[in-house]
Amino acid sequence: LVPHLGDREKRDSVCPQGKYIHPQNNSICCTKCHKGTYLYNDCPGPGQDTDCRECESGSFTASENHLRHCLSCSKCRKEMGQVEISSCTVDRDTVCGCRKNQYRHYWSENLFQCFNCSLCLNGTVHLSCQEKQNTVCTCHAGFFLRENECVSCSNCKKSLECTKLCLPQIENVKGTEDSGTT
């Protein structure tokens, strides 16, 4: 099966790499604009230059193109704890990230929030914190893992999953209760 191509891809595929078909004259292949520039005017004829202009401040193109406008630079989302790793240039978008000892949690494909890496108090680090993943903790005896925090088994209710991990503690508590009723 031949993959479906959009009109623009169909037009581009007729020309050699680095060129595109003139929108008004499909016998002419124009040279694409370099990254950092955009298409101001199509080439007037074969072998003639495409009129490309540099992106204005606050905009960019990251690859060769025949876009009529540059793309707007992204802004890092302060409300999600993001910080600017590198600022926007004419040929590269803003790079946003998190502070040291934080990781990215992606709510959707293009939206992330920064959270502090877990410290594994009352436990040990099983896997270190990564750019896109929180620390994985292993809890000491007498503690169980809840939302990636080591919580005392005294907070374990019988109905919860922690009962298996905290069984000795629960039995001890039960035994104490029973001995008090005789």
Partner: nanobody
Framework: EVQLLESGGGLVQPGGSLRLSCAAS????????MVWVRQAPGKGLEWVSH????????YYADSVKGRFTISRDNSKNTLYLQMNSLRAEDTAVYYC????????????WGQGTLVTVSS
């Protein structure tokens, strides 16, 4: 008792508009981000839009950009979602929620309001 109560959902024709409201009580509404998420039939949760505590920074999923507008009125403890040019694919239960600050997840959820876009 914490409550988030959504309203404003209903049946609307494609191209139509609705305004969802979320009345908050039982917590300090003006502190922190608020978010609208939705769940289409048989699908997972989708983050639709969020707004910061001051109402200055907003975010929209690509699927709703240019059609939906989020806003909040901290004096009325209310979050809004203005939905224009509605499409069949916007059909979902819409929830307002308060995201946690310390880890992924939500402190509070509403019960949801159903939006059905159909001719």
């Amino acid at each position: 008792e914490v409550q988030l109560l959504e309203s404003g959902g209903g049946l609307v024709q494609p191209g139509g508009s609705l305004r969802l409201s979320c009345a908050a009580s039982g917590f300090t509404f003006g502190n922190g981000n608020m978010v609208w998420v939705r769940q289409a039939p048989g699908k997972g949760l989708e983050w639709v839009s969020h707004i910061d505590e001051y109402g200055t920074n907003t975010y929209y999923a690509d699927s709703v950009k240019g059609r939906f507008t989020i806003s909040r009125d901290n004096s009325k403890n209310t979050l809004y979602l203005q939905m224009n040019s509605l499409r069949a694919e916007d059909t979902a239960v819409y929830y307002c929620a308060k995201p946690r600050n310390d880890r992924p997840g939500f402190d509070y959820w509403g019960q949801g309001t159903l939006v059905t876009v159909s001719s």
